[in-house]
């Protein structure tokens, strides 16, 4: 048993261009707090439950208000350490996630609103009982400086907190075969009670006769390194310290959600829906009361006066989840068809339809010609959600209201001359041609290619095109 301790030194803009805007302002004062999540091993993809080593939430930092015009400085931090107690042996290799949260202060119902500012993650080797290790991590334009260490809680000692120490029974020396417990020279190592042959480096025990293995070791005496050679098609990187990665269908493989949370895949990762009393990325933060402000986005917290009684978040319109942490994105399902736009009015969804479409989801193609008049003898043609008029000769435009020049398209063939006429156009054909558009050549013998010329018209006469 022992405690992992994290000391945040600073959180502020990192070096280089593109300094981030201050998360707080005169109009929006806020304060920071931090959350740390630890899990054993070096593999982020490993299927063990998240935050298996534990998680901790810091106190809230001092209220900060940005000075207008000043660059975002290092932001004021909460006092004290973040402490994550661990019950079993310290694994020696671990992964961490440190999140910086912003708490917006205001008088909204249900307390302040929280939003995640930055998240850093890493994998480290660390022996318990060693000195503070310093670290710098960057998340976007932000930089987080911190130190961490793992220390054993008495009577445990050693790099994995697996050796036990007891006060000396004699004032001068320890019993036969037992060493003094450095650095507590006035204590002696307790007699080993593990299974005979259990590796002193890679195994430990909490009960007499047992042999439990540290990360990366296996076998009855913890003497066999975990092998990767027998792994078949691992999904991600693996190493001798982490063992095989079990292939799976996706990010919810092995259910990364703790405490009975249910996992659902998202385009980039996964999302946990947490049961009441738990929240966090993987539902690993628990023992929450209303005093902790667990309801996000202005949710109203009811009940939960102590960690044993559940609280309930009453969410404002547009939010859901046991902690009101999820925005209700009903429009993201694209319910509106035919280019209609989706409006989420809180109490209801509405599709605003484009012209020519109707229905709750804009699914009905309207009779485009209903109530639409085409002027000057034009006829309405339906289609495509917008009516179209087929205009009579001499007229054009959307509704046939514009007078068209019937000769604009040069309809008379073979050099015939076009004349606009009240009922259309007239082609005066060049010698040797006839027809409404001068399209027929006249044969040299005087007979035309037509069966007969219409009565009263001689070849070469102007033909009126109706």
């Amino acid at each position: 048993a022992g405690v992992f301790e994290l000391q945040i030194h600073s959180f502020g803009p990192g070096p280089g261009p593109g300094a981030p805007r201050s998360p707080c302002s005169a109009r929006l004062p806020c304060r920071l707090f931090f959350r740390v999540c630890l899990k054993p091993g070096l593999s982020e993809e490993a299927a063990e439950s998240p935050c298996a080593l534990g998680a901790a939430l810091s106190a809230r930092g001092p209220v900060y208000t940005e000075q207008p015009g000043a660059p975002a400085p290092d932001l004021p931090l909460p006092d004290g350490l973040l402490q994550v107690p661990f019950r079993d042996a310290w694994p020696g290799t671990f992964s961490f996630i440190i999140e910086t949260w912003r708490e917006e202060l205001g008088d909204q119902i249900g307390g302040p609103a929280w939003s995640l500012l930055a998240r850093v993650a890493g994998r480290r080797r660390l022996a318990a009982g060693g000195p503070w290790a310093r670290d710098i991590q960057r998340a976007g334009a932000w930089e987080l400086r911190f130190s961490y260490r793992a220390r054993c809680e008495p009577p445990a000692v050693g790099t994995a907190c697996t050796r036990l120490c007891r006060p000396r029974s004699a004032p001068s020396r320890c019993g036969p075969g037992l060493r003094p417990c450095a650095p507590l020279e006035d204590e002696c190592e307790a007699p080993l009670v593990c299974r005979a042959g259990c590796s002193p480096e890679h195994g430990f025990c909490e009960q007499p006769g047992e042999c439990r293995c540290l990360e990366g070791w296996t076998g009855p005496l913890c003497t066999v390194p975990v092998s990767t050679s027998s792994c078949l098609s691992p999904r991600g990187p693996s190493s001798a310290t982490t063992g095989c990665l079990v292939p799976g269908p996706g990010p919810c493989d092995g259910n990364p959600c703790a405490n009975g949370g249910s996992c659902s895949e998202t385009p980039r990762s996964f999302e946990c829906t947490c049961p009441r009393g738990f929240y966090g990325l993987r539902c690993e933060v628990s023992g929450v009361t209303c005093a902790d402000g667990p309801c996000f986005n202005g949710g109203l917290c009811v009940g939960g006066a102590d960690p044993d009684s559940a609280y309930i978040c009453h969410c404002p319109p547009g939010f859901q989840g046991s902690n009101c942490e999820k925005r209700v994105d009903r429009c993201s399902l694209q319910p509106c068809r035919n280019g209609g736009l989706c409006l989420d009015l809180g109490h209801a969804l509405r599709c605003r339809c484009r012209a020519g479409f109707a229905g709750p989801r804009c699914e009905h193609d309207l009779d485009d010609c209903a109530g639409r008049a085409c002027a000057n003898g034009g006829t309405c043609v339906e289609g495509g959600g917008a009516h179209r008029c087929s205009c009579a000769l001499g007229f054009g435009g959307r509704d046939c209201r514009e007078r068209a020049d019937p000769c604009a398209a040069r309809p008379c063939a073979h050099g015939g001359r076009c004349y606009a006429h009240f009922s259309g156009l007239v082609c005066a054909c060049a010698p040797g041609y006839m027809g409404a558009r001068c399209e027929f050549p006249v044969h040299p013998d005087g007979a035309s290619a037509l069966p007969a010329a219409p009565p009263g018209l001689r070849p070469g006469d102007p033909q009126r095109y109706l």
Partner: antibody, heavy 124, light 110 residues
Framework: QVQLQQSGPGLVKPSQTLSLTCAIS??????????WNWIRQSPSRGLEWLGR?????????DYAVSVKSRITINPDTSKNQFSLQLNSVTPEDTAVYHC??????????????WGQGTMVTVSS | QSVLTQPPSASGTPGQRVTISCSGS????????VSWYQQFPGTAPKLLIY???QRPSGVPDRFSGSKSGTSASLAISGLQSEDEADYYC???????????FGTGTKVTVL
Amino acid sequence: QVQLQQSGPGLVKPSQTLSLTCAISGDSVSSNSVVWNWIRQSPSRGLEWLGRTYYRSKWYDDYAVSVKSRITINPDTSKNQFSLQLNSVTPEDTAVYHCARGGIVGAPDAFDIWGQGTMVTVSS
Amino acid sequence: QSVLTQPPSASGTPGQRVTISCSGSSSNIGSDPVSWYQQFPGTAPKLLIYTNNQRPSGVPDRFSGSKSGTSASLAISGLQSEDEADYYCAAWDDSLNGHVFGTGTKVTVL
């Protein structure tokens, strides 16, 4: 972080075509949950919405009645931008032109991200 | 020209509550959600309220919106000196088939 960067000339002669471009970073012009708009602002007319383009399985556009006969808004997916063309301009078209995103899911009418604005003067 | 009508100016002392009205018709405010924008000189407008009363993240809860019938209003409680700006309402207009904006209200902090 979504940003809109406008570009285009600040001076256009009467009867010519005003052309502006809005480059998008942090979002996609062909996203099926946003709407891309052009809006202008002048002392005489105040804020005036000109038109929009958006993608919902195919491209759609809508234009304000006041400019419908001479406006075109086109998306350019290869450059992740959209453009405004306003033909036959007159001094009345002198204004600050803004591109803006309607990007809140369920609130396409709310312009949550704006370009920096381009002052366009129509003068010979 | 602007279809939605706002008072040209409004003022208050620090800490006071100021309300700006926006009057429209059945084809805009009466049937569609209202947005509010804040604009400082020389900058683009900033979204303050959408869907009548929703605040985007980062907007203080001193700003609140409401709608009734064909009118909408923006309230600023606990007025601060940095609230001195122009404020515009906006909505979609079904008959014009386009967005319409308000005439704008200049808020002065005395």
